[in-house]
Amino acid sequence: QGWQAFKNDATEIIPELGEYPEPPPELENNKTMNRAENGGRPPHHPFETKDVSEYSCRELHFTRYVTDGPCRSAKPVTELVCSGQCGPARLLPNAIGRGKWWRPSGPDFRCIPDRYRAQRVQLLCPGGEAPRARKVRLVASCKCKRLTRFHNQSELKDFGTEAARPQKGRKPRPRARSAKANQAELENAY
């Protein structure tokens, strides 16, 4: 199926506070992961801050005509193309409990389609041929999803489903920590 670009603009997906749910407590290895409510120093941003736009998962809006052989849609359709980076975690505060930010390398995320929508289009054909009706599947929204070793690169795992495994080489310490980990960044960029 051919596509002809008509125009495009961009929308940045910057997650709101609380957009991602907290993991169940048992996934945190019986530890409180330095959240602000556990006391300690007031939160601040220890990590190097970059321009948010450099890391946003963007929805590029493309207006195109749908073509099928010699036939073309009577009206253009608007579709999203997912583009840009995912992170940093300062935009995803509720994910921090799962993140082991002190590691030099961590989960890799991609900006990919999240939801789709079906749209019926009417195709006009040359030579007096009767118009055809076609249903097309269009990207409706984008999301940061984690690459996972249990899937192919094309099949991605939702950001909110990452579970922390117990780590080797350390014992659970169920006591309050400083607020600093709340400010961690997952600077995963592509």
Epitope: R103, S105, G106, L147, G169, R177, A181, E185, L186, E187
Partner: antibody, heavy 119, light 110 residues
């Protein structure tokens, strides 16, 4: 100027202990996660251990687990590596390194201290 | 034997573009971000690329990183004599639960 300076290296017999230190300056120490990375003579880099803001955030390489202990003293701007039951294969240049960008690589390095384990 | 596989050596002439590969598996590069380090002779390593393709401030844009599947690459364009060094890739390995380095690639500028 951001600086990490390692000390405590030396010649030690197999089975003995050694404690490495890393003194930091030029940055807010407890904003950084800190790591030990070693390099055997003529060989590549090998990550040894890492610690976050406190002892609740620690990782070790399998090769040193149970023998080495990483710790930090934020009041003294210092990182430590207690090395017990040393083996000949632990002979290496030990680097102290840090990262203050979550999952963003080790962006600060010391010049290293040499540990030689030999009988 | 390193968990991440790099060619032991690479070479190029000044001005040329050179690429260094790093091959891993689904438990390291396939899942986690890749970092690259440069170690000039007799000096400590230096972070060159983090999070697959991001350059820390001060690193020239001649250096670029990319990742696809379980492999990563470091590209150096406009090769200069001062680029002669050892280059290491690294990533967290979820199976080993540790930070793993490639064996290193010695880059020679002819």
């Amino acid at each position: 100027e951001v600086q990490l300076v390692e000390s405590g290296g030396g010649l030690v017999q197999p089975g003995r202990s050694l404690r490495l230190s890393c003194a930091a300056s030029g940055f807010t120490f407890d904003d950084y996660a800190l790591h030990w990375v070693r390099q055997a003579p003529g060989k590549g880099l090998e990550w040894v251990s890492g610690i976050g803001w406190d002892d609740d955030m620690i990782d070790y390489a399998d090769s040193v687990k149970g023998r080495f202990t990483i710790s930090r003293d934020n009041a003294k701007n210092s990182l430590y590596l207690q090395m017990n039951s040393l083996r000949v294969e632990d002979t290496a240049l030990y680097y102290c390194a840090g990262n203050n960008r979550g999952y963003g690589g080790l962006d600060v390095w010391g010049q290293g201290t040499t540990v030689t384990v030999s009988s | 034997q390193s968990v991440l596989t790099q060619p032991p050596s690479a070479s190029g002439t000044p001005g040329q573009r050179v690429t260094i590969s790093c091959s891993g598996s689904s438990s390291n590069i396939g899942t986690n971000t890749v970092n690259w380090y440069q170690q000039l002779p007799g000096t400590a390593p230096k972070l060159l690329i983090y999070s697959n393709n991001q350059r820390p401030s001060g690193v020239p844009d001649r250096f670029s990183g990319s990742k696809s599947g379980t492999s990563a690459s470091l590209a150096i364009s406009g090769l200069q004599s001062e680029d002669e060094a050892d280059y290491y890739c690294a990533a967290w390995d979820d199976r080993l639960d540790e930070y793993v380095f490639g064996g290193g690639t010695k880059l020679t500028v002819l």
